[in-house]
């Protein structure tokens, strides 16, 4: 395994309909043609898989299809959207990409995006 | 805990054919690169041929054109069909899975299993 370098924005926050996007891009030291690219939340030193999905270069990325994430790939750059986001899915969202072919296999890890999701505020009664 | 068991090796005449299977628990096809090693006595282990998630395969030189990769999802299982052997194929074959879980690289390797190519 070789390591490299997976760059991503520090903080980003959500639309009031509870989507993020940001853009994940990963130094690749050969042409890769299989990626594999996983978001992953930490929170409270604990670490859980929010999507992944490989895809061939050139090709869209495909998510499976209950999946909360979306994304596009452009070169070595992997733009990502996660819907469906409440204030309580606030956290560091980080970015794993690994380049599965050709060999050498490489495994490259980002230091995060915070993102900040706040609720909505409900619209007030309104008397007429 | 990814677990891999290794079976079908055994004794074949030198141009015989031999058929490795790998057996995997779980689904792991979908995020690890699946291969399989050799180590023959006195050398050190190499890489014999691997498949990707995307089904891509990656073959040593010395066995393409004669050894096949392929998997089964339905059945998570990886084989390696072997046609033509010879005598320096002789060696402890083992199942190997890496790629990362979580915020780590993962490998994990199989018990092995001998494959002797003699007359």
């Known amino acids: 395994c070789k390591a490299m370098h997976v760059a991503q924005p520090a903080v980003v926050l959500a639309s009031s309909r509870g989507i993020a996007s940001f853009v994940c891009e990963y130094a690749s030291p050969g042409k890769a043609t299989e990626v594999r690219v996983t978001v992953l939340r930490q929170a409270d030193s604990q670490v859980t898989e929010v999507c992944a999905a490989t895809y061939m270069m050139g090709n869209e990325l495909t998510f499976l299809d209950d999946s909360i994430c979306t994304g596009t790939s452009s070169g070595n750059q992997v733009n990502l959207t996660i819907q469906g986001l409440r204030a309580m899915d606030t956290g560091l969202y980080i970015c794993k990409v690994e380049l599965m072919y050709p060999p050498p296999y490489y495994l490259g890890i980002g230091n995060g995006t915070q993102i900040y999701v706040i609720d909505p505020e409900p619209c007030p009664d309104s008397d007429f | 805990e990814v677990q891999l068991v290794e079976s079908g090796g055994g004794l074949v005449q030198p141009g015989g054919s031999l058929r490795l299977s790998c057996a995997a628990s779980g689904n792991i096809f979908s995020r690890y690169i699946m291969g399989w090693y050799r180590q023959a006595p006195g050398k050190q282990r190499e890489s014999v041929a691997t498949?990707?998630?995307?089904?891509?395969?990656d073959y040593a030189d010395s066995v393409k054109g004669r050894f096949t990769i392929s998997r089964d999802g339905a059945k998570n299982t990886v084989d390696l069909q072997m046609n033509s052997l010879k005598p320096e194929d002789t060696a402890v074959y083992y199942c190997?899975?890496?790629?990362?879980?979580?915020?780590?690289?993962?490998?994990?390797w199989g018990q092995g299993t001998q494959v002797t190519v003699s007359s």
């Open positions: 498949i990707t998630p995307g089904g891509n395969t």
């Open positions: 190997n899975a890496r790629g990362s879980s979580g915020l780590s690289m993962s490998t994990y």
